[in-house]
């Protein structure tokens, strides 16, 4: 039985489609292609005589159609008006003609989408971020990608406005990364350039690493004190030290050579992040023994958290 296959079935505007004829009868002598579901002279696109290999355009011919000896019809630079049914009539030598109808659907060419954001530098646990994929295109599917992956399932992620808008409620630091939106219809897809979400966070409660010699938590007179403070923060936090409440340097590492009992006291590391407006600190008490006894670091540090 004569059949028509459209390749592809869903065509993007401006592309081409090939209507392929299958199971052509042996005794064929010519073909005619019509726009629509029936044979009608007014909707004849093109006729073809096999013997002379002559193609004759009809009233519905647009100049974009090409008929091949195997009865296939190529339509180039398709428009949405080309959507619909196409009928092939195979003319046989016994004059008992065969007909078959095929169809295809033309979808608009999709523009390259872009992402707008209400806040590309949100503060963790404080701000929400809404990404909007533009423009709005009818009969289009909107998809979102985070760091090249599909959206994770999270109660903090909300899709709205036909998936055009992605809202991150109360952002977390691990929401940082590259966000892309993609628009799709059955014929094509187009993806936006990535937008980077930079989540401002911290500073977390700092930790002090006692890189000391001798090791462990023993502070003997004459040892070197080397305290390193670290706090997770974006941007990197500003560090500062206080010894017994007296401001010291603004470095991550506090080094004191050859400590003595005069160095006893509280050692506080302060961290601040102007971008989040948050500060934090940790205090350690240090005792230095004059002789062979080995007191040390009070690891039960006090944490100070400020907003």
């Amino acid at each position: 039985k004569l059949t028509i296959e459209s390749t592809p079935f869903n065509v993007a505007e401006g592309k081409e489609v090939l209507l392929l004829a299958h199971n052509l009868p042996q005794n064929r002598i010519g073909y005619s292609w019509y726009k629509g579901e029936r044979v009608d002279g007014n909707s004849l696109i093109v006729g073809y005589v096999i013997g002379t290999q002559q193609a004759t355009p009809g009233p519905a011919y647009s100049g974009r159609e090409t008929i091949y000896p195997n009865a296939s019809l190529l339509i180039q630079n398709v428009t949405q008006n080309d959507t619909g049914f196409y009928t092939l009539q195979v003319i046989k030598s016994d004059l008992v003609n065969e007909e078959a109808t095929g169809q295809f659907h033309v979808y608009p060419e999709l523009p390259k989408p872009s992402i707008s954001s209400n806040n590309s530098n949100p503060v963790e646990d404080k701000d929400a971020v809404a990404f909007t994929c533009e423009p709005e295109v009818q009969n289009t599917t909107y998809l979102w990608w985070v760091n090249g992956q599909s959206l994770p399932v999270s109660p903090r992620l909300q899709l709205s406005n036909g998936n055009m808008t992605l809202t991150l409620l109360s952002v977390k630091r691990n929401d940082a990364g590259s966000y892309e939106c993609e628009i799709q219809n059955p014929a094509s897809a187009n993806r936006s350039d990535p937008v980077t979400l930079n989540v401002l966070y911290g500073p977390d409660v700092p930790t002090i690493s006692p890189i000391i010699s001798p090791p462990d938590s023993s502070y003997l007179s004459g040892a070197n004190l080397n305290l390193s403070c670290h706090s997770a923060s974006n941007p990197s936090p500003q560090y500062s030290w206080r010894i017994n409440g007296i401001p010291q340097q603004h470095t991550q590492v506090l080094f004191i050579a050859k400590i003595t009992p005069n160095n006893n006291g509280t050692y506080a590391c302060f961290v601040s992040n102007l971008a989040t407006g948050r500060n934090n600190s940790i205090v350690k008490s240090i005792t230095v023994s004059a002789s062979g006894t080995s007191p040390g670091l009070s690891a039960g540090a006090h944490h100070h958290h400020h907003h």
């Epitope: 401002l200 941007p235 990197s236 500003q238 340097q249 603004h250 991550q252 102007l274």
Partner: antibody, heavy 120, light 107 residues
Framework: QVQLVQSGAEVKKPGASVKVSCKAS????????LHWVRQAPGQGLEWIGY????????SYAQKFQGRVTMTRDTSTSTVYMELSSLRSEDTAVYYC?????????????WGQGTLVTVSS | DIQMTQSPSSLSASVGDRVTITCRAS??????LAWYQQKPGKVPKLLIY???NLVEGVPSRFSGSGSGTDFTLTISSLQPEDVATYYC?????????FGQGTKVEIK
């Protein structure tokens, strides 16, 4: 007290290289980043880049990428800034400056400056 | 890169006057902004960091304010020794960029 002492003035021909030194004293050399800033005659300040003396890590302004190299010698508490393929527009006073603290701080101590003149 | 725009480029004021210099950043600086003073023939000197923190030893007539992208350096009562060029600089990550400078003179 903190001091940054730079090498003396240099006169170079276009296409040559210049290497300026900056010797730090009065603080723990490896604890503070050191930056280089230049100032053309009658002009403003232009950041060139920095070096972390602890690790040797460097970061340069895009404008100077490929032409500038910063190194350090921890044994002498000295940092060096070498600028190659000199042109007349590189005529300037070159300053080394210490970052006030670690991460996102400005520059609190500056060297006296080294005048580099590029002329044929 | 972040652009820093200072205004005015120069000003002339009388001793005792209140002087204001503004600096605008092309992006939010979250308060990471410093001011320097450079007297003729001298090296730059840090006056203020984190928008408003006065460096030890700097006279209290100098003050800083602002947030986001707009910042101000104020000299509450101009003194003869304040004749200099003043530069703003953002210090939130590198590359650091400076304003083009404001030259302050005495009338």
């Amino acid at each position: 007290q903190v001091q940054l002492v730079q090498s003396g003035a240099e006169v170079k021909k276009p296409g040559a290289s210049v290497k300026v030194s900056c010797k730090a004293s009065g603080y723990i050399f490896t604890s503070y980043y050191l930056h280089w800033v230049r100032q053309a005659p009658g002009q403003g300040l232009e950041w060139i880049g920095y070096i972390n003396p602890q690790t040797g890590y460097t970061s340069y302004a895009q404008k100077f990428q490929g032409r500038v190299t910063m190194t350090r010698d921890t044994s002498t508490s000295t940092v060096y800034m070498e600028l190659s393929s000199l042109r007349s527009e590189d005529t300037a006073v070159y300053y080394c400056a210490r970052e006030y603290g670690n991460y996102n701080y400005p520059l609190d101590y500056w060297g006296q400056g080294t005048l580099v003149t590029v002329s044929s | 890169d972040i652009q820093m725009t200072q205004s005015p480029s120069s000003l002339s004021a009388s001793v005792g006057d209140r002087v204001t210099i503004t600096c605008r950043a092309s992006e939010n600086q979250y308060g990471y902004l410093a001011w320097y003073q450079q007297k003729p023939g001298k090296v730059p000197k840090l006056l203020i960091y984190n928008t408003k923190n006065l460096v030890e030893g700097v006279p209290s007539r100098f003050s800083g304010s602002g947030s986001g992208t707009d910042f101000t350096l104020t000299i509450s009562s101009l003194q003869p020794e304040d004749v200099a060029t003043y530069y703003c600089q953002h210090h939130l990550g590198t590359p650091y960029t400076f304003g083009q400078g404001t030259k302050v003179e005495i009338k």
